[in-house]
Amino acid sequence: VSPTFQVVNSIAPVQECSTQLDIVIVLDGSNSIYPWDSVTAFLNDLLERMDIGPKQTQVGIVQYGENVTHEFNLNKYSSTEEVLVAAKKIGRRGGLQTMTALGIDTARKEAFTEARGARRGVKKVMVIVTDGESHDNHRLKKVIQDCEDENIQRFSIAILGSYNRGNLSTEKFVEEIKSIASEPTEKHFFNVSDELALVTIVKTLGERIFALEA
């Protein structure tokens, strides 16, 4: 599949590959994300097309605000159906601060461990969804470098909703979230105008994640 997802005859289509992925989704659950239903709809639309299982794709979810919570580990569920049920039940934990570096670092150090289901030799993918600048951005550069050193592919999503609602400049925020994404940035960074628009990036994000299998 080419970068624009047109079928290229010389490469086997994405679905034919049986390569495994370990995917950890890092969700900003701070108070400013609204409505939370849009986040769960996004998760549903992204996850429902994945082949989830111990020998296929595994998915874990981490939520952060001021603190970090492992919603479920990579090896917790062994089917797409189970993951969808669990993802629907995830509520926003809230928090006045957005500790994005902490969320990413915890995912790297804890969610991607064998104890929590990560598999040796399997490609690691992190999807970070956030709606605001981090309160610990002084740590971001080091945290991202650590992810890079561990070959964790990162997709980052900036939700501009709270900025647009407050008529605030998004420039600094977008730059920060771009810095989280793997290179090339244009293939790994997404921004959406508000939470409701999250579903509009699902298909492109999904194909890009699965292009990593090829």
């Epitope: 624009t4 082949d51 797409t80 298909k203 699965f210």
Partner: antibody, heavy 120, light 113 residues
């Protein structure tokens, strides 16, 4: 080459159920999503939903929720679409169709269609 | 859900003439970060299943004659047949695959004048 061969025409009474099959060949059946699209006589195309033959996962259009069931038998590379509580306006040609990619639903390969007539 | 509206509903064109069919979506199907429009065009002849002509709004499927072309962006799209041939008599449908559920236009019937 990819081929989707559907079961033959059916005549059903209102309130009954119909199960249409779609046998796939020429590719790895579990590797690609199968979609179902219907077309009432003289009308346009209506997407009904998809099944992931690998996991059995499904996504149904809201209009058909509760009435449609999509299943598959991987041992014979066949997908099925069952529609229950049939009404006269379910009279249509039902197509199975295969997508090229996992998330993008443009449909390159189509079955020949199965005419389902609902009449008392 | 995204609603797709085609115009005209039917048209009659002389052989060799250029013809255009329009399709409008109720919301944008443009993925702006890479300029991809999630739109496909199909041709359906009587008694046959639809045939994919174009995807990404303008990418011609392999084997489709180059007299067929697609254009447009966002919410407004056009299928153009540069020189109508007798075998082009059919119903043409647009389809968006930007958001689930994917949806089709109501169809445009093309006949020979």
């Amino acid at each position: 080459q990819v081929q989707l061969v559907q079961s033959g025409a059916e005549v059903k009474k209102p309130g009954a159920s119909v199960k249409v099959s779609c046998k796939a060949s020429g590719y790895t059946f579990t590797g690609y999503f199968m979609h179902w699209v219907r077309q009432a006589p003289g009308q346009g195309l209506e997407w009904m939903g998809w099944i992931n033959p690998n996991s059995g996962g499904t996504n149904y259009a809201q209009k058909f929720q509760g009435r449609v069931t999509m299943t598959r038998d991987t041992s014979i590379s066949t997908a099925y679409m069952e529609l229950s509580r049939l009404r006269s306006d379910d009279t249509a040609v039902y197509y199975c169709a295969r997508s090229v990619l996992r998330y993008f639903d443009w449909l390159l390969w189509w079955g020949q269609g199965t005419l389902v007539t609902v009449s008392s | 859900d995204i609603v797709m509206t085609q115009s005209p509903e039917s048209l009659a064109v002389s052989l060799g003439e250029r013809t255009t069919i329009n399709c409008k979506s109720s919301q944008s199907v443009l993925f702006s970060s890479n300029n991809e429009n999630h739109l496909a065009w199909y041709q359906q002849k009587p008694g046959q299943p639809p045939k994919l002509l174009i995807y990404w709004a303008s990418t011609r499927e392999s084997g489709v004659p180059d007299r067929f072309s697609g254009s447009g962006s966002g919410t407004d799209f056009t299928l153009t047949i540069s020189s109508l041939q007798a075998e082009d008599v059919a119903v043409y449908y647009c389809q968006q695959y930007y958001i689930t559920p994917c949806s089709f236009g109501q169809g445009t019937k093309l006949e020979i004048k």
